[in-house]
């Protein structure tokens, strides 16, 4: 059979029928199914949710769904004992305490097993002492306070604000200055935009709201006991002391409210700088400890949360590809939330929903993919990704052989502004072509296309006329698919206008207040950006596991190679001195480069000229196109980060959300004028530079004529 | 054989400007990312710019930025420097840099009044 009988249509009708499946309505209605009640990962109502969606996919016509469990670390607070951050007078009686839960949105007062926030893998304990601010946490943050200011932070608590990079790396900084515990706040300067109202009058954070969150350094471990294995029945499970990525300190969330109380009192230094200044009416001084009338009154924190090992349940959706069903685009979000997950996940678990059911009615009416797609709901992704790396783990033999792409599907939107785009370089001109044939709905653009709207309203800042598609990073699913196996990966999702919101996320972001009511008032009303980010979702799963010739472009990866290589040589040559004399030559990357450049043309030439109706040469031209980003794993791993392999992107060493390049050479390079070694310093800069010139040397040979 | 040959130094007033140009052979131009580095009298080398493959990607240290300007012509194999604004401190060998391990021989510019 040729690929066009097996799939029973002609391919352009096909993507057709499967967009024109998808319906907002349907999207609304599952986002609403979906919200009611909490779904907390380990809980009975998250599992009963997994069965649910299990029995419907079945509905909707999946050739099989399963659930497959494992047995991960968890982290829950003591339901008796509850955890809280006080104000202590010098006789130890506490005449502050933060709340103990946020108050429930409207509607929701009754509603049951609505966990309190807290910080989860917490360890327990109840430090007391002086208060450092340490604005957001980051790595100059503490640069500025212990090499400008001379503020050592050993034995004191830190408060820090969240935004600008994951809460775990605030924890491993502070942890690494010395500070025997974290609180952790929502400023409004980051999580109120001006001129909105508080929930439920409106979209932002109200002073009793608090962001919930993991504070893992797992570098992509998934469950912390089972380290690059399943957490199986039979799984030998490392000692808590051995655990992966658990922080050593107590860390607990607050509310602006709360945080007011605390940073009012501050002494000490004033902030460096009007960068280290929030939005509440407060000084910011940094500290350490209160002002002159409360000098004598310190902080105690009081934590008792406690880890379990849980059993957790993804779904696991198939329909089978009908001429290469050995091949694997798989579609995969979470369906835990920290409370109602009003945005994250459900506004992503809808989506796929609805494009679960578009699919299923296709293959009702007789058609089938080309290529197998695997469709996966996600459990435990809030406490580390751990249902999406456990079931990667059980099946990374599989993955790596047959796995074509991963699309990711989280939160649908973060925002109502355009469209925003994360992916490797190879679905650059699939995600192009393919927002060219959708329509835009945003205002303004009525009869435009998508790539219109979204190229005018967020451009590319190299390349004039084309859309900013950004790197992925981690903090979600698709992170043991790209950064651990290797396979082609991406995600979408609607964005605020970064330029005009300057706050980190979407303020009411892992809060209780994150409800269907949110969704349906303020950001979605029609679910028409629902839809779109369904049909780029969709259409990006439709055209990977349907056309003929897999829609990647090796060329693309050539043009980022070359920009990335640039900006690595330009970071070192800061260094120019030291260049010369420990003999540092980027010619060996530069070179590779340039092959691979060369290489990925002429594949290119091939692929357009080949006889697209012998299925050998067919199967063997997308093999090299599946295994380009295989090619770029070292299976050694990054230095101290064995599970980040890509040797072109991993998650920043500095922010887990971010998305580094050459990350080997990057962090060889990083603060290396502070080396305490800098012949081995520099010599570990050599080192990557080789690592790196190497894979992409070889990468471009797994390009070239077979024989 | 990779070859650097810098031009354009020499002596300028302050507030002066300046047209530094490199002319490189014995490698493949265009694909390589190219930087300019100084050493002040008496001083240690300092990173001033660095070029990637277009003019679009440009990096400058703090001290020169909108005041120099680096460029490149592809088709002439020739990397450039155009100077503005010239201070005292920017009296310097300049050097241009290929990879990091390949330097010319350096251009003098000296900014006195």
């Known amino acids: 059979k040729s690929s066009n009988e097996a799939t029973n249509i002609t391919p352009k009708h096909n993507m057709k029928a499967f967009l024109d499946e998808l319906k907002a309505e349907n999207i609304k209605k599952f986002l609403y199914n979906f919200t009611q009640i909490p779904h907390l990962a380990g809980t009975e109502q998250n599992f009963q949710l997994a069965k649910q969606i299990q029995s419907q996919w079945k509905e909707f016509g999946l050739d099989s769904v399963e659930l497959a469990h494992y047995d991960v670390l968890l982290s829950y607070p003591n339901k008796t004992h509850p955890n809280y951050i006080s104000i202590i007078n010098e006789d130890g009686n506490e005449i502050f305490n933060t709340s103990l839960f946020e108050p429930p949105p409207p509607g929701y007062e009754n509603v049951s097993d609505i966990v309190p926030p807290f910080s989860a893998f917490s360890p327990q304990g109840m430090p007391e002492g002086d208060l450092v601010y340490v604005n957001y946490a980051r790595t100059e943050d503490f640069f500025k306070l212990e090499r400008d200011m001379k503020i050592n932070c050993s034995g004191k608590i830190v408060i820090a604000r969240y935004g600008k990079v994951f809460r775990g790396n605030k924890v491993k900084n502070a942890q690494l200055a010395g500070a025997k515990g974290v609180i952790l706040y929502s400023d409004p300067a980051d999580y109120f935009a001006p001129g909105v109202k508080s929930y439920p009058d409106g979209w932002n954070l109200p002073g009793g709201g608090v962001q919930r969150g993991n504070i893992l350094n797992l570098n992509g471990a998934g469950d912390p006991l089972t380290p690059g294995y399943p957490a199986n029945e039979y799984a030998y499970r490392r000692g808590i002391a051995e655990a992966v990525g658990l922080p050593s300190i107590p860390v607990h969330p607050i509310g602006y409210y709360d945080a007011q109380k605390l940073l009012e009192k501050m002494g000490g230094s004033a902030p460096p700088d009007s960068s280290w200044r929030g939005s509440l009416k407060v000084p910011y001084n940094v500290g350490p400890g209160f002002t002159g009338n409360f000098s004598t009154q310190k902080v105690k924190m009081h934590i008792h949360s406690t880890n379990e090992v849980t059993r957790i349940y993804n779904v696991i959706g198939t329909l089978r590809g009908a001429v290469e069903p050995d091949r694997y685009v798989i579609l995969g979000g979470h369906r835990d939330s920290w409370v109602f997950g009003g945005i994250d996940p459900q506004s992503g678990a809808a989506v796929v929903h609805e494009i679960v059911r578009s699919f299923g009615t296709l293959k009702k009416e007789g058609w089938r993919p080309r290529r197998t797609i695997l469709f996966a709901s996600w459990d435990a992704e809030e406490f580390g990704l751990l249902g999406s790396t456990e079931w990667a783990e059980e099946n990374s033999r599989l993955l790596q052989e047959r796995g074509v792409a991963y699309i990711n599907a989280d939160s649908s939107i973060e925002g109502n502004y355009t469209l925003r785009v994360d992916c490797t370089p190879l679905m650059y001109s699939l995600v192009h072509n393919l927002t060219k044939e959708l329509k835009s709905p945003d205002e303004g653009f009525e009869g435009k296309s998508l790539y219109e709207s979204w190229t005018k309203k967020s451009p590319s800042p190299e390349f004039s006329g084309m859309p900013r598609i950004s790197k992925l990073g981690s903090g979600n699913d698709f992170e043991v698919f790209f950064q651990r196996l290797g396979i082609a990966s991406g995600r979408a999702r609607y964005t605020k206008n970064w330029e005009t919101n300057k706050f980190s996320g979407y303020p009411l972001y892992h809060s209780v207040y994150e409800t269907y009511e949110l969704v349906e008032k303020f950001y979605d009303p029609m679910f028409k950006y629902h839809l779109t980010v369904a049909q780029v979702r969709g259409g990006m799963v439709f055209e990977l596991a349907n056309s003929i010739v897999l829609p990647f472009d090796c060329r693309d990866y050539a043009v980022v190679l070359r920009k990335y290589a640039d900006k690595i040589y330009s970071i070192s040559m800061k260094h120019p001195q030291e260049m010369k004399t420990y003999s540092v030559s980027f010619d060996s990357l530069f070179s590779a480069v340039k092959n691979f450049t060369e290489i990925a043309s002429k594949f290119s030439e091939r692929l357009q000229d080949f006889d697209k109706s012998n299925p050998i040469v067919l199967r063997m031209m997308n093999d090299q196109l599946m295994f380009l980003e295989r090619a770029f794993i070292d299976p050694l791993g990054l230095p101290d980060r064995p599970f980040y392999r890509h040797v072109i992107y991993a998650p920043s060493s500095h922010n887990k959300y971010a998305g580094e390049s050459f990350p080997g050479i990057y962090d060889a390079l990083f603060d290396i004028e502070s080396k305490v070694d800098p012949s081995k310093a520099w010599g570990e800069v050599k080192r990557q530079i080789y690592v790196a010139a190497f894979t992409v040397q070889a990468a471009a040979e797994t390009l070239s004529e077979v024989a | 054989e990779v070859q650097l040959l810098e031009s354009g130094g020499g002596l300028v007033q302050p507030g002066g400007s300046l047209r530094l140009s490199c002319a490189a052979s014995?490698?493949?131009?265009?694909?390589?990312?190219l930087s300019w580095v100084r050493q002040a009298p008496g001083k240690g080398l300092e990173w001033v710019s660095s070029?990637?493959?277009?003019?679009?990607?440009?990096d400058y240290a703090a001290f020169v930025k909108g005041r120099f300007t680096i460029s490149r012509d592809n088709s002439k194999n020739t990397l450039y420097l155009q100077m503005n604004s010239l201070r005292v401190e920017d009296t310097a060998v300049y050097y241009c840099?290929?990879?990091?391990?390949?330097w010319g021989q350096g251009t003098l510019v000296t900014v006195s009044s």
């Open positions: 070029i990637g493959e277009n003019n679009h990607t440009t």
């Open positions: 014995g490698f493949s131009f265009s694909s390589y990312a």
């Open positions: 840099v290929k990879d990091g391990v390949h």
